[in-house]
Interface confidence: low
């Protein structure tokens, strides 16, 4: 693996904890991931919906599986996208 690939990996894994944070400073990152999830039909970064912690309840449409062509799973009684976003984000960064 290249050094840049490793840095991207580490950065994304490190930022996973921001999804479950409740401070104002993390909101911008969370909102960016929400937009990305809707676009690429994925959920969370590493562990799926669980990455969002208690915030999962606070964003009503988070990860909601409306396109059943994509793999979905049940999480806290809701149907959510099964695939995590990390690989999509890495592909997106590589292409841009």
């Amino acid at each position: 693996k290249s050094k840049s690939d490793r840095i991207v990996n580490e950065t994304l894994y490190e930022n996973t904890k921001l999804l479950s944070a409740t401070g104002e400073s993390e909101k911008q990152f969370q909102e960016a991931i929400i937009v990305f999830q809707e676009e690429f039909k994925c959920c969370g970064l590493v562990n799926g919906a669980a990455d969002w912690g208690n915030n999962f309840q606070h964003y009503p449409e988070l990860c909601a599986c409306l396109d059943k062509q994509r793999p979905c799973q049940s999480y806290n009684g809701k149907q959510v996208y099964k695939e995590t976003c990390i690989s999509f984000i890495k592909d997106f960064l590589a292409k841009n």
Epitope: Q57, Q69, G77
Partner: antibody, heavy 121, light 106 residues
Framework: QVQLVESGGGVVQPGGSLRLSCAAS????????MHWVRQAPGKGLEWVAV????????YYADSVKGRFTISRDNSKNTLYLQMNSLRAEDTAMYYC??????????????WGQGTLVTVSS | EIVMTQSPATLSVSPGERATLSCRAS??????LAWYQQKPGQAPRLLIY???TRATGFPARFSGSGSGTEFTLTISSLQSEDFAVYYC????????FGQGTKVEIK
């Protein structure tokens, strides 16, 4: 047996508001997603809105987005549709319907008998 | 939005004959398709879900088939109580209905 009984329909002027209710019985209401579907006189069925079992997710057809609000009161086993800025093209029979799944992403398995909404001056 | 197209709009059939109704999706909906029966003055009733699974209360003369974009509802031998309007609906991505097929007595 599953029963869905709509009420609140009637005649209203363009620009007016109306609130539809749907009383549910015969099943655990708080475990199911619920839809509103409408049917204009002599026309086909049009999906209007859906709400998750716990009220956390709500989705609307483009034709009603920003004007209609779906909500539910699980303690009262009741589904609601608040309809604002009504137009002539909203004239229809409005059906309350149950989704087969709690998160309201599957097929409709039970329907109410409907309540008629007429928008006319 | 996925557009559902049903054909024919009206089907004239004699009692005892076979009726074949078609439903086409503008993009794949896998097997996430339902059929509903609606009689005049009544609410629709779930007839078929998952493209081919018959709902409770409907006899074996009703059958559904297809997947992807092409679906068929077949009524093997029409009875008087089967004359109605039939709607297909996809629930693969949001929810959209076909315009309906009216099955009438010939």
């Amino acid at each position: 047996q599953v029963q869905l009984v709509e009420s609140g329909g009637g005649v209203v002027q363009p620009g007016g508001s109306l609130r539809l209710s749907c009383a549910a019985s015969g099943f655990i209401f708080s475990s199911y997603g619920m839809h509103w579907v409408r049917q204009a006189p002599g026309k086909g069925l049009e999906w209007v809105a859906v709400i998750w079992y716990d009220g956390s997710n709500k989705y609307y057809a483009d034709s009603v987005k920003g004007r209609f609000t779906i909500s539910r009161d699980n303690s009262k086993n009741t589904l609601y549709l608040q309809m604002n800025s009504l137009r002539a093209e909203d004239t229809a029979m409005y059906y309350c319907a149950r989704d087969h799944y709690g998160s309201g992403t599957y097929y409709i398995d039970y329907w109410g008998q409907g309540t008629l909404v007429t928008v006319s001056s | 939005e996925i557009v559902m197209t049903q054909s024919p709009a009206t089907l004239s059939v004699s009692p005892g004959e076979r009726a074949t109704l078609s439903c086409r999706a503008s993009q794949t909906v896998s097997s996430n398709l339902a059929w509903y029966q609606q009689k005049p003055g009544q609410a629709p009733r779930l007839l078929i879900y998952g493209a081919s699974t018959r709902a409770t209360g409907f006899p074996a003369r009703f059958s559904g088939s297809g997947s992807g974009t092409e679906f068929t509802l077949t009524i093997s031998s029409l009875q008087s109580e089967d004359f109605a309007v039939y709607y297909c609906q996809q629930y693969n991505n949001w929810w959209t209905f076909g315009q309906g097929t009216k099955v009438e007595i010939k």
